[in-house]
């Protein structure tokens, strides 16, 4: 029962996490204009992974996509890649984990297969969460670097345009969504790996019980027939899967001199 709960909770947490990663990737507010020096600007700038936006005091919001691919900073491309890899792995993990859920019965799938799939999906969720956390952290590092580097007349913005007044950018809402979502996906993955250990059936040794019928000397050993209901314990010897998931080395981010924001 505890295993089913752990697996189910892991799935739900990962599902929320991956939804959050998708939301963060699509959000426009990865970096927002720092209003410390000018809290009453009539023009508010913010940028995402795919486009930059300007919200005017009039209520009008104008967004422009980054229609260039080669002209974008390598770090931004790396963040995009990390987030997309995280989403893809997470989506595959969700698909696998649906079939691995103990409460869902698919044909005559054995517990060993479910345990294997649970572990696979768990590892996928862990890597997915790490990708999201790494992507958001790389972007945050880029923002911090550029925040202190930003001076008047420097080349800034996605297209490398010259600006004549200092515009600094700070952390946007998407970064916090990404960090939380990545963490949830990671936690969900760990829970799936823990559930995997409980799913893998251990070797069950049954003691033979002899029933002596009058006039017969036949010993009946239970366990000789497979349970047809699908709920009984399977007494076949199964390989016990180790739930300790190996994760890839953490992506180390170095301060970049890319004038992104």
């Amino acid at each position: 029962m505890a295993v089913t709960a752990c697996q189910g909770l892991g799935f739900v947490v990962s599902l929320i996490g991956i939804a959050g990663i998708i939301a963060a990737t699509c959000m426009d507010q990865w970096s927002t204009q720092d209003l410390y020096n000018n809290p009453v600007t009539a023009v508010f700038n913010y940028q995402g992974l795919w486009r930059s936006c300007v919200r005017e005091s009039s209520g009008f919001t104008e967004c422009r996509g980054y229609f260039t691919l080669l002209g974008l900073p390598a770090m931004l491309q790396a963040v995009r890649a990390l987030m997309i890899v995280g989403i893809v792995l997470g989506a595959i993990g969700l698909l696998v984990s649906i079939f691995a859920l103990k409460c869902i019965r698919i044909g005559s799938m054995e517990d060993s297969a479910k345990a294997n799939m649970t572990l696979t999906s768990g590892i996928m969720f862990i890597v997915s969460g790490l990708c999201a956390i790494a992507g958001v952290s790389v972007f945050a590092n880029m923002l911090v670097t550029n925040f202190w580097m930003s001076t008047a007349n420097m080349y800034t913005g996605m297209g490398g345009m010259v600006q004549t007044v200092q515009t600094r950018y700070t952390f946007g809402a998407a970064l916090f969504v990404g960090w939380v979502a990545g963490g949830l996906t990671l936690i969900g993955g760990v829970m799936m790996c823990i559930a995997c250990r409980g799913l893998a059936p251990e070797e069950t040794n049954y003691k033979a019980v002899s029933y002596h019928a009058s006039g017969h000397s036949v010993a009946y050993k239970p366990g000789g027939f497979k349970a047809s209901t699908g709920f009984g314990s399977n007494t076949k010897n199964k390989k016990i899967y180790d739930g300790g998931a190996r994760t890839e080395d953490e992506v180390q981010s170095y301060p970049s001199k890319h004038d992104y924001v």
Epitope: Q33, N38, V40, T41, A42, V43, N45, Q47, S52, C53, V54, E56, S57, S58, G59, F60, E62, R64, T156, G157, M161, Q163, T164, V165, T167
Partner: antibody
Amino acid sequence: EVMLVESGGGLVQPGGSLRLSCAASGFTFSTYTMSWVRQTPEKRLEWVATIVGGGGYTYYLDSVKGRFTISRDNAKNTLYLQMNSLRAEDTALYYCARMGLTQRNALDYWGQGTLITVSS
Amino acid sequence: DIVMTQSPLSLPVTPGEPASISCKSSQSLFNSGNQKNYLAWYLQKPGQPPKLLIYGASTRESGVPDRFTGSGFGTDFTLKISRVEAEDVGVYYCQNDHTYPLTFGAGTKLEIK
């Protein structure tokens, strides 16, 4: 046709209060950011206050902050300017103006104005 | 606050002749996010409220004759009238639309010679 009609102006003593109204018609009032702009007797234009469409954000000229309050009633299509602790330097022709949606924050429509004279 | 400085304060022009008004801001009105300049030009005719002529430093408001042209970048802006007509008489104001308070220039009075 877009129309902005101001009312509530008049003669008031220093330290007194007055409430200006601006009745809007011919456009979806709640969508637009609205402003009050005044023109001094020397013919200088001075922005006074701005309120965004939903009414959530307001901006004021430093010299009127704490004394003037801009508000709006989207159901009645009306903009207000509550003026307290009036001073002689507040004497001006007060215009109600609409901030154009795609006009880069420029004021695309103005009312005819209402005159306020602060004098003892 | 951003200070808007207009010149000249008075501009006598012969009908049919060109006219040029300058406006300088103490801070840049250029926004790097969308590569736009947040400056507007208004004309106030006697006994009337100001009327929007140009926004975004160079975009003509609908209904404004094409003899009016706005130009400039950052801190220096110009309003040009290719051929002045009698109906163009009035006071021209430039306005900062970038940062609150939304300051106006002192105005340039265009008169017919």
